[in-house]
């Protein structure tokens, strides 16, 4: 796969993953009421990172935000933090990668700068994806722990007139947001890895330039307007100059130019 394609695909995959991370963070269905092996209720409960909701069979849905910070479980706060960090890193990663894309020309930015920016954005996407995956996994672990605790105390007997009165404890299981978060985190991670791979292809390595220099000195160079443009790629007309795969050639010259493969 060419560097441009790898970089572009990595960017698109990361972008999709990033959008998914935002969606998961905003979704209300991080945990949903467990309906299996439970008395059938006409009320369905589900919870997100920011609010909890109740949907009645009447169709009426009521959501209440968690308006306290101190009263919330530390794990929930940690998950929130991880998701927000993931989003922030993703935003920075996207901004950096836009400037790093090979298909976008900004001023006289050379490929080594683009390579560094591609690597930076790749690392940012990788960390963003990891944050999302860890966040979702921590929440899932919290749910599993609570699920088995509630199962153990599924029916707590309450003394009352006419014998024992049963209280049904609402158990929660994985909501759609968890799966969205896992997939989104994975995509962002994969996209980041692809960006890092693309960076390697963008980096001009020294041996290529030595080869070009050696080739130029061993030939009779035809002097034309533009200096050494035809042979070295370092002519005075650098307006459209680009370095592909470590070789030296210019976009506005149709003749064959030396590349690293000429010296194998």
């Amino acid at each position: 796969m060419s560097v441009t394609a790898c970089q572009g695909l990595g960017f698109v995959v990361s972008l999709i993953g990033f959008a998914g991370i935002i969606a998961a963070t905003c979704m209300d269905q991080w945990s949903t009421q467990d309906l299996y092996n439970n008395p059938v209720t006409a009320v369905f409960n589900y919870q997100g990172l920011w609010r909890s909701c109740v949907r009645e069979s009447s169709g009426f849905t009521e959501c209440r935000g968690y308006f306290t910070l101190l009263g919330l479980p530390a794990m929930l706060q940690a998950v929130r933090a991880l998701m927000i960090v993931g989003i922030v890193l993703g935003v920075i990663g996207i901004l950096v990668s836009i400037f790093a894309l090979k298909c976008i020309r900004i001023g006289s930015m050379d490929d080594s700068a683009k390579a560094k920016m591609t690597l930076t954005s790749g690392i940012l996407f990788i960390i963003s994806g990891i944050c999302a995956i860890i966040g979702v996994s921590v929440f899932a672990n919290m749910l599993v722990t609570n699920f088995w605790m509630s199962t153990a105390n599924m029916y707590s007997g309450m003394g009352g007139m006419g014998g024992m009165v049963q209280t049904v404890q609402t158990r929660y299981t994985f909501g759609a947001a968890l799966f969205v978060g896992w997939v989104a985190g994975g995509l962002t991670l994969i996209g980041g890895v692809m960006m890092c791979i693309a960076c390697r292809g963008l980096t001009p390595d020294d041996s290529n330039f030595k080869a070009v220099s050696y080739h130029a000195s061993g030939q009779n160079v035809a002097y034309r307007p533009g200096g050494f443009k035809a042979s070295t790629g370092f002519g005075s007309n650098t307006r459209n100059k680009k370095i592909y795969d470590g070789g030296a050639r210019t976009e506005d010259d149709e003749q064959s130019h030396p590349t690293k493969y000429d010296y194998v």
């Epitope: 008395p39 059938v40 209720t41 009645e56 069979s57 009521e62 049963q166 049904v168 404890q169 609402t170």
Partner: antibody
Framework: QVQLVQSGAEVKKPGSSVKVSCKAS????????IEWVRQAPGQGLEWMGL????????NYNEKFKGKVTITADKSTSTAYMELSSLRSEDTAVYYC???????????WGQGTLVTVSS | DIVMTQSPDSLAVSLGERATINCKSS????????????LAWYQQKPGQPPKLLIY???TRESGVPDRFSGSGSGTDFTLTISSLQAEDVAVYYC?????????FGQGTKLEIK
């Protein structure tokens, strides 16, 4: 305003079937569940089942499963409740009701008296 | 199924006096998700369909006089008529709106003493 108008009284022979209709108006029919409740003479209220007119999904009281079939026609905004294999103990007033906040029944039809007699 | 038990079965109260009807469910009707109790109260007069008075155990339906109030949580609920009027003579039912199948209490007949 919300209105539920039920079909008229029926007299049926044991073993036969009856289909009671409930025409809704004054609201988006597909958006609210329709519930069916019966009341035997001098007795209390008994929930039979419900239908989601939008999806056609139903939920029946176990006691009435196989006995009652609830359907809905969105084009005419009408819900139907069919009782099969009628027996004398099925003699009752049958009500349709529209669900409201808290899953309560705020709007009721006028009731349909079904009499099963040989 | 959830059993709803009303007490008393019948009640005679003087005009202007307070009337109290109790309802007990075999399981808690409190939903932890929104801290609401899924219990409704209905009034039924002879030859008429039931009329919704209270939902969510204590929320009065619009158009219902404020002399009607609902209270209670979990398994024990109360309907109170603060000052009985002649038009309040009827049968009152509580209903479980939380678990399927929805179940009603056996009814409490309210009369004037």
């Amino acid at each position: 305003q919300v209105q539920l108008v039920q079909s008229g009284a029926e007299v049926k022979k044991p073993g036969s079937s009856v289909k009671v209709s409930c025409k809704a108006s004054g609201y988006a029919f597909s958006n609210y569940l329709i519930e069916w409740v019966r009341q035997a003479p001098g007795q209390g209220l008994e929930w039979m089942g419900l239908i989601n007119p939008g999806s056609g999904g139903t939920n029946y009281n176990e006691k009435f499963k196989g006995k009652v079939t609830i359907t809905a026609d969105k084009s005419t905004s009408t819900a139907y409740m069919e009782l099969s294999s009628l027996r004398s103990e099925d003699t009752a007033v049958y009500y349709c009701a529209r669900v409201y906040y808290g899953n309560s029944f705020a709007y009721w039809g006028q009731g349909t008296l079904v009499t099963v007699s040989s | 199924d959830i059993v709803m038990t009303q007490s008393p079965d019948s009640l005679a109260v003087s005009l202007g006096e307070r009337a109290t009807i109790n309802c007990k469910s075999s399981q808690s009707l409190l939903n932890s998700g929104n801290n609401k109790n899924y219990l409704a109260w209905y009034q039924q007069k002879p030859g008429q369909p039931p009329k919704l008075l209270i939902y969510w155990a204590s929320t009065r339906e619009s158009g219902v006089p404020d002399r009607f109030s609902g209270s209670g949580s979990g398994t024990d609920f109360t309907l109170t008529i603060s000052s009985l009027q002649a038009e309040d003579v009827a049968v009152y039912y509580c209903q479980n709106d939380y678990f399927y199948p929805f179940t009603f209490g056996q009814g409490t007949k309210l009369e004037i003493k």
